[in-house]
């Protein structure tokens, strides 16, 4: 099979994942301890290999008794990291991942950082701030995103195969122009990534180039390929 023209284009439609912190300037805002603060859960997609900072509810330090981070990762015992203000003491239970740490000393900053984010960091992270007025929670459902590797090739006469390899979550594949496509295949890997494969055929001889467009939460990519001539075809007028 000769390798005919294959071009890559990375679209400009990428989602903004560079700023992997949801910590606003809210700590500088004096908050009334309203019931709204009592329980907040955030679903947060974060790209693998980036750094992430997770923050606690905006409670003034003087009102604090204990800060606890509870980390529940798939297939592992719950890890807790706590800090007691009165004794200036930190404690960890079942925490073995050295990439998950306090941003600085907890008396300075209660935020948690993941440096860098790995696929195993999918899970639930919760900050519990104990105060004389009660406990205030902020939870994160962290979804680690993995950019798929995109490939496109012509397998046989006017049939092209587009693969989005090892993405998380699964990518979506579309074609320009639409072809006669087999059902999309998905292959699930043990680490939670998915390979998606789309195979399409174009009967019309006026189709010169086909474009495979891969949509993913980490950004969109397109590849295009000029189809080879049908064997035996010599000359045609369009």
């Amino acid at each position: 099979q000769s390798n005919n023209s294959l071009m890559l284009q990375t679209s400009k439609e990428n989602h903004t994942l560079a700023s992997n912190s949801l910590c606003m300037d809210e700590k500088q805002i004096t908050q009334n301890h309203s019931k709204v603060l009592a329980e907040v859960n955030i679903s947060w997609p974060v790209q693998m290999a980036r750094n992430a900072v997770l923050c606690c509810p905006p409670i003034e330090f003087r009102n604090l008794i204990v800060i606890t981070w509870e980390i529940i990762l798939r297939g592992q015992p719950s890890c807790t990291k706590s800090y007691r203000k009165e004794t200036n003491e930190t404690k960890e239970t079942n925490c073995t991942d050295e990439r998950i740490t306090w941003v600085s000393t907890p008396d300075q900053n209660s935020d948690l950082q993941i440096h860098p984010v790995a696929i195993t960091h999918d899970g639930y992270y919760r900050c519990i701030m104990a105060t004389p007025d009660g406990n205030f929670h902020r939870g994160y459902h962290l979804q680690v995103l993995v950019t798929p590797e995109v490939t496109l090739f012509e397998s046989r006469n006017r049939t092209a195969v587009c693969k989005a390899v090892a993405g998380k979550p699964a990518a979506q594949i579309s074609w320009i122009p639409a072809g006669d496509c087999a059902p999309t295949e998905q292959e699930y890997w043990g680490n939670g990534t998915v390979t998606v494969k789309s195979t399409c055929h174009w009967e019309g001889h006026n189709v010169s180039t086909v474009t495979c467009h891969v949509s993913h939460l980490t950004g969109n990519k397109s590849l295009y390929i000029e189809l080879l001539p049908v064997p035996g075809a010599k000359k045609s007028a369009k």
Partner: antibody, heavy 114, light 107 residues
């Protein structure tokens, strides 16, 4: 780095023929379609046709099928376009292009004049 | 054949302006395209391949985007050297077809 070399200009008589060349380097010549495009002075661009050097397969735009003839010589990595029965309407710059239209030659100016 | 409708055919803008031009395939046919810049007496220069991919060496003020079946070339801050004619090329269907061009002049 793909390069397509074309002669700068050709002066031909009305009714005559001319064979334009396009010598390729920097890529697998037989694996990429070669296209030809026409641009008349101060006007838009028109696609003439394409040829696949690996098999000799050719497509022509209907408008150019009796005007242009595309050929290749794989040993010299050169594509050719012969234009016949030339008139003043054929005076134009002719470009060859490959790699799905991302690599262009500098163009050959064909002037048809008595 | 797929006709490429390009607009405007000409435009005049000041240095520093944001400039946009559009190409759309007839009947809203889904296609892919390239954007080129051409200066008098020169061969077309590829700016954007495959609708949105900025070519090496092309200033970052140029960008391409797709909105459904419409394609836009944007110059974020116009410079003197951008005075040229711009055109699109659809390469999905044979025959390949070009937009009519947008002649950009500096005010």
């Amino acid at each position: 780095q793909v390069q397509l070399q074309q002669p700068g200009s050709e002066l031909v008589r009305p009714g005559a023929s001319v064979k334009l060349s396009c010598k390729a380097s920097g890529h697998t010549f037989t694996s990429y379609w070669m296209h030809w495009v026409k641009q008349r002075p101060g006007q838009g661009l028109e696609w003439i046709g394409n040829i696949y050097p690996g098999s000799g397969s050719i497509n022509y735009d209907e408008k150019f099928k009796s005007k242009a003839k595309l050929t290749v010589d794989t040993s010299s990595r050169t594509a050719y376009m012969q234009l016949s029965s030339l008139t003043s309407e054929d005076s134009a710059v002719y470009y060859c292009l490959t790699m799905t239209g991302t690599s262009w030659g500098q163009g050959t100016l064909v002037t048809v004049s008595a | 054949d797929v006709q490429m409708i390009q607009s405007p055919s000409s435009l005049s803008a000041s240095l520093g302006d944001i400039v946009t031009m559009t190409c759309q395939a007839s009947q809203g046919t889904p296609i892919n395209l390239h954007w080129f810049q051409q200066k008098p007496g020169k061969a077309p220069k590829l700016l954007i391949s495959g609708a949105s991919n900025l070519e090496d060496g092309v200033p970052s003020r140029f960008s391409g985007s797709r909105y459904g079946t419409a394609f836009t070339l944007t110059i974020s801050s116009l410079e003197d050297e951008d005075m040229a004619t711009y055109f699109c090329l659809q390469f999905t269907y044979i025959p390949w077809t070009f937009g009519g061009g947008t002649k950009l002049e500096i005010k």
